[in-house]
Interface confidence: medium
Amino acid sequence: MRKTRLWGLLWMLFVSELRAATKLTEEKYELKEGQTLDVKCDYTLEKFASSQKAWQIIRDGEMPKTLACTERPSKNSHPVQVGRIILEDYHDHGLLRVRMVNLQVEDSGLYQCVIYQPPKEPHMLFDRIRLVVTKGFSGTPGSNENSTQNVYKIPPTTTKALCPLYTSPRTVTQAPPKSTADVSTPDSEINLTNVTDIIRVPVFNIVILLAGGFLSKSLVFSVLFAVTLRSFVP
């Protein structure tokens, strides 16, 4: 009984240590149904210009799911549309533009831009975007404030690209590129974003964890490993 409690305690210490070591930033966007999310994901121009890029959603406790991706190799400024998602890769500027038009409440969730680089794992472009879509009128006639560009017209020449099947929750430890977004809608008072609601998101990554390299309290790891090992020894 005491051994089980100790084991549980060590796991808790281990997990909390891991959570502290693998925090990712997340920014929150609050939009209304019918509005458009318009996100810019920056990437290193020289490294990733022609790499295939994707827009993913991360549902609680699940692997990231790819919703749309660019062609392979990625074509410059060539829109790719998958349903209500439009991707455009601007090679000259090192940025991927992602638009989600006519947002629905069920679109709420955590999103990220990634770069596919097989056979390696996808490279995540930080930060993640916490999208909150609420019900409400997004375009009241005669409203007192309007965006000068109210409606996103879906480009006529869009392509649907085939995305790789694999997804990965693995994080990347290098310095994160930034992402920026603009919202353009027919709202009377257009809620741009709650851009500054930055939440620190712990990412539980057992792969990096077992590599063991970046835990500051290596003692916790060692003791936990020893206890775990002992519990398997007859």
């Epitope: 318009d38 601007y90 533009r97 741009l192 974003t193």
Partner: antibody
Framework: QVQLVQSGAEVKRPGSSVKVSCKAS????????ISWVRQAPGQGLEWMGG????????NGAQKFQGRVTITADESTSTAYMELSSLRSEDTAVYYC????????????????WGQGTTVTVSS | AIQLTQSPSSLSASVGDRVTITCRAS??????LAWYQQKPGKAPKLLIY???SLQSGVPSRFSGSGSGTDFTLTISSLQPEDFATYYC?????????FGGGTKVEIK
């Protein structure tokens, strides 16, 4: 670091138009957000609108709708603000400002400003 | 449009004083607020963004706080070069709006 240089002072007649330019150098103009802000003599700051050159996306205050046109020329890294049907109350210093830090939303905080262009509307 | 009300509209202070300027939004704007400093005949200068983040190159005597509807800019120890007009600006929703300004004068 991006620098913004604006066109010179203008004196205009009521009912005419003025076009102010804002040339960027030393940074990523296309993916910056360029705002236009004006300040009447002895008054506060007033946001007129903005543009993201790479996307051509513009947003503006209703107060100026139908009178202001904001454009950008990526090839010369220059943004323009044209204000038509001028009246005496449009006499002000017009500033262009860029948001180059960037973090999701384009008009996050205007961290680079032009020197200002004085527009005087007088008959 | 979201209205920003700054107070006081002007204040007199001495070098070394602690100065506090407040900015109240007509509705919640999360932390989507910036503070600017403007000197006569000059363009505004960004001091604080995201309500409390100090813009690079800005002295640490400047600090911002608040969230929702009430925000504060504090100058911990006023220096001669700090005599200027200060503006708050929200970027939570279009149109972007500025406060009316607070003029900090020498006592």
């Amino acid at each position: 670091q991006v620098q913004l240089v604006q066109s010179g002072a203008e004196v205009k007649r009521p009912g005419s138009s003025v076009k102010v330019s804002c040339k960027a150098s030393g940074g990523t103009f296309s993916s910056s957000a360029i705002s236009w802000v004006r300040q009447a003599p002895g008054q506060g700051l007033e946001w007129m609108g903005g543009i993201i050159p790479i996307f051509g996306t513009t947003n503006g205050a209703q107060k100026f709708q139908g009178r202001v046109t904001i454009t950008a020329d990526e090839s010369t890294s220059t943004a323009y603000m044209e204000l038509s049907s001028l009246r005496s109350e449009d006499t002000a210093v017009y500033y262009c400002a860029a948001m180059v830090r960037g973090n999701y939303f384009y008009f996050y905080g205007m961290d680079v400003w032009g020197q200002g262009t004085t527009v005087t509307v007088s008959s | 449009a979201i209205q920003l009300t700054q107070s006081p509209s002007s204040l007199s202070a001495s070098v070394g004083d602690r100065v506090t300027i407040t900015c109240r939004a007509s509705q919640g704007i999360s932390s989507a607020l910036a503070w600017y400093q403007q000197k006569p005949g000059k363009a505004p200068k960004l001091l604080i963004y995201a309500a409390s983040s100090l813009q690079s190159g800005v002295p640490s005597r400047f600090s911002g706080s608040g969230s929702g509807t009430d925000f504060t800019l504090t100058i911990s120890s006023l220096q001669p070069e700090d005599f200027a007009t200060y503006y708050c600006q929200q970027y939570n929703s279009y149109p972007l709006t500025f406060g009316g300004g607070t003029k900090v004068e020498i006592k």
